[in-house]
């Protein structure tokens, strides 16, 4: 009888993570007597996957009925494959012996490659907000994919970005891989509603890429523009001064009125109006009783936006331009929720 040969017909097998891998092996003879074993890897560090002789291998099932001596099919199935199972598997025939069984003949090996989907990309932006015209960095990470080949693209509002750097780790062979990319984005005042998208394409995704998004509303700070104006006289001794706070984001804003440098009133932006671009406008009124002042008044609208240093705009109120009623220091009627009388 010809000497036993161990035949592994498949040089390689490709399996999706979570599925079952079938590793084929047949022997050409019933002799010598002794067990078949499966190993991952070769050499002294090889890992035992299945032993016909003994042991408990819950993930492994034999394809054929090994309780029949005439059966020479030693193929196995390994269930619930993960990227960690990738490697070269050897079907090895042993000859019964002591003190140990003796390796008699090995198959040529079957390389098991595992296709694993990348995790959903996670996009993160800078820790602190930035203002328009500044360049900010966004990172995108995805993990656990195999094989290594992967494509990553960045978009801002559907327009592909070109200023980014991508790394896939590790560089060498591995059971699975991770991708890390950093994109640079220049902010504009119109970016409150903008989105940055990281798109990952991989062979396991069948043409349906995974996307991770970041809203620039989390990143941008649009500082307000201020305009202080004097409204027409409402009564002979009253002037209405307004501070228009325009095009700011986020909403967190505190406004202080100063009269000749002295704090008159502080309020927080509440009932704001939203612009189409996502920024906010707000207006504060100040009702000034000019009859209470002998000299010109310098009114200052001071705004602290989103914890940033205050910006201000002033308006000089010419008292001499208004006739005064002697002894009149009566409070004028307060007609607006943001109005305040100054005496």
């Amino acid at each position: 009888e010809e000497e036993l040969q161990v035949i592994q017909p498949d040089k390689s097998v490709l399996v999706a993570a979570g599925e079952t891998a079938t590793l084929r092996c047949t022997a050409t003879s019933l002799i010598p007597v002794g067990p078949i074993q499966w190993f991952r890897g070769a050499g002294p560090g090889r890992e035992l996957i299945y032993n016909q002789k003994e042991g408990h291998f819950p993930r492994v099932t034999t394809v054929s009925d090994l309780t029949k001596r005439e059966n020479m099919d030693f193929s196995i199935r390994i269930g619930n494959i993960t990227p960690a199972d990738a490697g070269t598997y050897y079907c090895v025939k042993f000859r019964k012996g002591s003190p140990d069984d003796v390796e008699f003949k090995s198959g040529a090996g079957t390389e098991l490659s595992v296709r694993a989907k990348p995790s959903a990309p996670v996009v993160s932006g800078p820790a602190a907000r930035a203002t328009p015209q500044h360049t900010v960095s966004f990172t995108c990470e995805s993990h656990g994919f195999s094989p290594r080949d992967i494509t990553l693209k960045w978009f801002k509002n559907g327009n592909e970005l070109s200023d980014f750097q991508t790394n896939v780790d590790p560089v060498g062979e591995s059971v699975s891989y991770s991708i890390h990319s950093t994109a640079k984005v220049v902010l504009t005042r119109e970016d409150v509603h903008s989105q940055v998208i990281c798109e990952v394409a991989h062979v396991t995704l069948q043409g349906d890429p995974l996307r991770g998004t970041a809203n620039l509303s989390e990143t941008i700070r649009v500082p307000p523009t201020l305009e202080v104006t004097q409204q027409p006289v409402r009564a002979e001794n009253q002037v209405n001064v307004t501070c228009q706070v325009r095009k700011f984001y986020p909403q967190r804003l505190q406004l202080t009125w100063l009269e000749n440098g002295n704090v008159s009133r502080t309020e927080t932006a509440s009932t704001v109006t939203e612009n189409k671009d996502g920024t906010y406008n707000w207006m504060s009124w100040l009702l000034v009783n000019v009859s209470a002042h002998r000299d010109d008044v310098k009114l200052t609208c001071q705004v602290e936006h989103d914890g940033q240093p205050a910006v201000s705009k002033s308006h000089d109120l010419k008292v001499s331009a208004h006739p005064k009623e002697q002894g009149s220091n009566t409070a004028a009627e307060n007609t607006g929720s943001n109005e305040r009388n100054i005496y």
Partner: antibody, heavy 118, light 107 residues
Framework: EVQLVESGGGLVQPGGSLRLSCAAS????????MHWVRQATGKGLEWVSA???????YYTGSVKGRFTISRENAKNSLYLQMNSLRAGDTAVYYC????????????WGQGTMVTVSS | DIQMTQSPSSLSASVGDRVTITCRAS??????LAWFQQKPGKAPKSLIY???SLHSGVPSKFSGSGSGTDFTLTISSLQPEDFATYYC?????????FGQGTKLEIK
């Protein structure tokens, strides 16, 4: 059902011959290593002979040159030709099947009695 | 040839007892050791192979252990049908050899 049935035992004079048969059913005999084991009355078990799937044969020292193990695949049968029998060969002879991969005995026949006496 | 030595040669025990029979090989036999049960006038029955694996249909009260030269057969809770003679056997190399047997009797 997997079964082994021995036959051919009996009374024989010293120096005589006897041929034991073992009919296998429920499996293909040629795919297994097959054995003969004997047991003298009131004594322990003694392995006698074996034949491998490739036709290779093995014997215990006391029967070498006198006993011959063989098989006939067409009849799915195992044989033990015993020549130059001695009184010490008196025993029940069992036909035994070797295990699937390690040749561990798994199936035994009921045995046939061989008596060598004048 | 490899010699197989069983101890004890005979053993008296009661129903419900746990008993252990030992078998020693004269040289390393890996774990190619089998245990058989034989009742008077009957053919032996295969219980255990490769020192610890139970043959199909053998109750789990039988267990085997050991490797190299020293082996044991344990019966966890004796029942009346377990009183018999037990043999160990090495089958790592020809000639296969048996122990002399251990007769398990009712006390």
């Amino acid at each position: 059902e997997v079964q082994l049935v021995e036959s051919g035992g009996g009374l024989v004079q010293p120096g005589g011959s006897l041929r034991l048969s073992c009919a296998a059913s429920g499996f293909t005999l040629s795919s297994y290593d097959m054995h003969w084991v004997r047991q003298a009355t009131g004594k322990g078990l003694e392995w006698v002979s074996a034949i491998g799937t490739a036709g290779d044969t093995y014997y215990t020292g006391s029967v070498k040159g006198r006993f011959t193990i063989s098989r006939e695949n067409a009849k799915n049968s195992l044989y033990l030709q015993m020549n130059s029998l001695r009184a010490g060969d008196t025993a029940v002879y069992y036909c035994v099947r070797g295990g699937v991969w390690d040749d561990a005995f798994d199936i035994w026949g009921q045995g046939t009695m061989v008596t060598v006496s004048s | 040839d490899i010699q197989m030595t069983q101890s004890p040669s005979s053993l008296s025990a009661s129903v419900g007892d746990r008993v252990t029979i030992t078998c020693r090989a004269s040289q390393d036999i890996n774990n190619y050791l089998a245990w058989f049960q034989q009742k008077p006038g009957k053919a032996p029955k295969s219980l255990i192979y490769t020192a610890s694996s139970l043959h199909s249909g053998v109750p789990s009260k039988f267990s085997g252990s050991g490797s190299g030269t020293d082996f044991t057969l344990t019966i966890s809770s004796l029942q009346p049908e377990d009183f018999a003679t037990y043999y160990c056997q090495q089958y790592v190399s020809y000639p296969y050899t048996f122990g002399q047997g251990t007769k398990l009797e009712i006390k």
